[in-house]
Amino acid sequence: AVNGTSQFTCFYNSRANISCVWSQDGALQDTSCQVHAWPDRRRWNQTCELLPVSQASWACNLILGAPDSQKLTTVDIVTLRVLCREGVRWRVMAIQDFKPFENLRLMAPISLQVVHVETHRCNISWEISQASHYFERHLEFEARTLSPGHTWEEAPLLTLKQKQEWICLETLTPDTQYEFQVRVKPLQGEFTTWSPWSQPLAFRTKPAALGKDT
């Protein structure tokens, strides 16, 4: 068995992708390894080749079908194995039973756009990508706005505790460049985590009208 210095972590994007990371201290960088997925109640199985992402970790994506196809449900259990080549045969390094809807990480929101911008306000909308219809409205969002002279880490988080794919940013400074990001998380799942942040959307507030009190 793999000792405590090894980790095997996977997430399901709720549709047709399981992304996995395997790390093992002391493993050879050029070792050929793969992840094999066997669902308990499906006719298909899938394999992906683990590729190095750092000195001691490897990652791969199990592509289960077309991006928007619903390949797994809340009752599925997938047995995931890490196999590494040793000479002419494959050695099993780790075995994990994985409940997909307990291990969710959605794709980052897409299609961010400015709906309306004023001197102190900006209305922004976005869309979720490859998210299961099973969630219905059971999603939440976090958003952040990058102000001049600050970092993303300093930006306060705005929480939307419902499926609301828009936000009205207020108390902005006129004629100022901002960037905006949003991420999404389903409400269900023992190990469910936030999606990656969306690509930043850059926008500029309108300048204050000359001669008027702002």
Epitope: A1, V2, N3, G4, S6, Q7, F8, T9, A94, Q96, D97, F98, K99, E102, N103, G189, E190, F191
Partner: nanobody, 127 residues
Framework: QVQLVESGGGLVQAGGSLRLSCAAS????????MGWFRQAPGKEREFVAA????????MYAVSTEGRFTCSRDNAENTVYLQMNSLKPEDTAIYYC????????????????????WGQGTQVTVSS
């Protein structure tokens, strides 16, 4: 904290199946990660399987070769070990264990990670 009682062991022929149960009482079962270990005569205690608090991830010893399935029912305060295609080398005392600390289900835990142990149930596989 919980107390653990295993059951379901016995004598079975090679190729047969057994389902072990581990009933927990006296605590909040869903706040514990649960594991199964085994100890054959003259050998060290060996990891078999471990499942997270909600059962979202379960790690198995490579030696189980996909023959064993660990599951839990938090409503019934019970964790199970379904053992299929049993071999003589599976003969051992099987122990249920509970872990009070957080377990992510992404690595193989050590027996020292578990704080609470059952008394064990004997499994004998004859050839």
């Amino acid at each position: 904290q919980v107390q653990l009682v295993e059951s379901g062991g016995g004598l079975v022929q090679a190729g047969g199946s057994l389902r072990l149960s581990c009933a927990a009482s006296g605590g909040t079962f869903s706040s514990y990660a649960m594991g199964w270990f085994r100890q054959a005569p003259g050998k060290e205690r060996e990891f078999v399987a471990a499942t997270t608090r909600g059962g979202g991830r379960t790690m198995y010893a490579v030696s189980t070769e996909g023959r064993f399935t660990c599951s839990r029912d938090n409503a019934e305060n019970t964790v199970y070990l379904q053992m299929n295609s049993l071999k003589p080398e599976d003969t051992a005392i099987y122990y249920c264990a509970a872990m009070t600390s957080y377990y992510s289900g992404t690595y193989y835990p050590d027996s020292s990670d578990f704080d609470i142990w059952g008394q064990g149930t004997q499994v004998t596989v004859s050839s």
